[in-house]
């Protein structure tokens, strides 16, 4: 069971300081941006992180949403990352959900965050380069200290 606590507005960056945004095709991508670019591209660079209390002691659970015309929420259904048109719900009556991720700080690096899928244990949000694009994907953690699954989250509200 997941009960919503509150939400905040955030900018999410990978460890190469690229900013996460949602493009015109609703794809989550990373791109080099100045602070000015980041502001100019809002609301596509501003993510609503809704925090949830897990009824099991597994950590801080979150959903990641974006509001352009409508609110869309990040999903990892079938291990494929996409945004689905939905509001983050007040309650999720299950122990797993494709839209719930466990947000944890990286040991020894309190400002760096990891997001583990609640549906697929051991799978994390990650940044992966595919041709000329830097995409947000779901990736199985295969090595300790993998920088591709680490992010910074900056409060923007």
């Amino acid at each position: 069971y997941f009960g919503k606590l509150e939400s905040k507005l955030s900018v999410i960056r990978n460890l190469n300081d690229q900013v996460l945004f949602i493009d015109q095709g609703n794809r989550p991508l990373f791109e080099d941006m100045t602070d000015s670019d980041c502001r100019d591209n809002a609301p596509r660079t501003i993510f609503i992180i809704s925090m949830y209390k897990d009824s099991q002691p597994r950590g801080m659970a979150v959903t990641i949403s974006v509001k352009c015309e409508k609110i869309s929420t990040l999903s990892c259904e079938n291990k494929i990352i996409s945004f689905k048109e939905m509001n983050p719900p007040d309650n999720i009556k299950d122990t797993k959900s494709d839209i719930i991720f466990f947000q944890r700080s990286v040991p020894g690096h309190d400002n760096k965050m990891q997001f583990e899928s609640s549906s697929y244990e051991g799978y994390f949000l990650a940044c992966e380069k595919e041709r000329d694009l830097f995409k947000l994907i779901l990736k199985k953690e295969d090595e300790l200290g993998d920088r591709s699954i680490m992010f910074t989250v900056q409060n923007e509200d």
Epitope: Y1, F2, G3, K4, L5, E6, S7, K8, L9, S10, I49, M51, Y52, K53, D54, S55, P57, R58, G59, M60, P89, D90, N91, K93, R104, S105, D110, N111, N155, E156, D157
Partner: antibody, heavy 120, light 111 residues
Framework: EVQLVESGGGLVQPGGSMRLSCTAS????????MSWVRQAPGKGLEWVSG????????YYADSVEGRFTISRDNSKNTLYLQMNSLRAEDTAVYYC?????????????WGQGTLVTVSS | QSALTQPASVSGSPGQSITISCTGT?????????VSWYQQHPGKAPKLLIY???HRPSGVSDRFSGSKSGNTASLTISGLQAEDEADYYC???????????FGTGTKLTVL
């Protein structure tokens, strides 16, 4: 202006019951989890109970689990704490609170507190 | 769930700096950046000084600063003033069955 106003405190005998209410104004009540925090005379702060935005998730300190029930009515902007099987050690000032969790404008709101005295 | 551990009392002279520690576990302080610090004067409701380990709400003096290392968070007050004499509490989100946990409290005396 944000306000949290508690009511319902007073004197009750051991084993008795009492219901506290907290009416909120000045912020969007249904967007935040709420908590009850208490402070026994001369003692420190103790988190008692919390409730999620929609009321489906309820959380309790071990010391009150099974005796206290937290609830909320978002249509009335009101938080409740039903206290049963009260003990002398439940004597305290009870604060209704929206602690600051995260984000630069989350806000940290506390009521003025209401005194609950459990004594025969 | 156990309260976070703080020293019962600390003291310092005006102008000095003092640090108050707050020790928890990986289920609370160590596991999350959701640590807050409160100041409480007698008969008053607590006042927030620090949220998310090191962030100050607007209106709080920059003499107050927070940090964290492992399972221990710290509050530092620099340039002590007479009005800083009060009780100080840390608080953290916890992944246990409860939601928040407070520290045991520290009484600050300005000599």
């Amino acid at each position: 202006e944000v306000q949290l106003v508690e009511s319902g405190g007073g004197l009750v005998q051991p084993g008795g019951s009492m219901r506290l209410s907290c009416t909120a104004s000045g912020f969007t009540f249904d967007e935040y989890a709420m908590s009850w925090v208490r402070q026994a005379p001369g003692k420190g702060l103790e988190w008692v109970s919390g409730i999620s935005t929609g009321g489906g998730g309820t959380y309790y300190a071990d010391s009150v689990e099974g005796r206290f029930t937290i609830s909320r009515d978002n249509s009335k902007n009101t938080l409740y704490l039903q206290m049963n099987s009260l003990r002398a050690e439940d004597t305290a000032v009870y604060y209704c609170a929206k602690p600051w969790l995260s984000g630069s404008r989350s806000g940290d709101f506390w009521g003025q507190g209401t005194l609950v005295t459990v004594s025969s | 769930q156990s309260a976070l551990t703080q020293p019962a009392s600390v003291s310092g002279s005006p102008g000095q700096s003092i640090t108050i520690s707050c020790t928890g576990t990986s289920s609370d302080v160590g596991g999350y950046n959701y640590v807050s610090w409160y100041q409480q004067h007698p008969g008053k409701a607590p006042k927030l000084l620090i949220y998310e380990v090191s962030h100050r709400p607007s209106g709080v003096s920059d003499r107050f600063s927070g940090s964290k290392s492992g399972n221990t968070a710290s509050l530092t007050i620099s340039g002590l003033q007479a009005e800083d004499e009060a009780d100080y509490y840390c608080s953290s989100f916890t992944s246990s069955s409860s939601l928040y946990v407070f520290g045991t409290g520290t009484k600050l005396t300005v000599l």
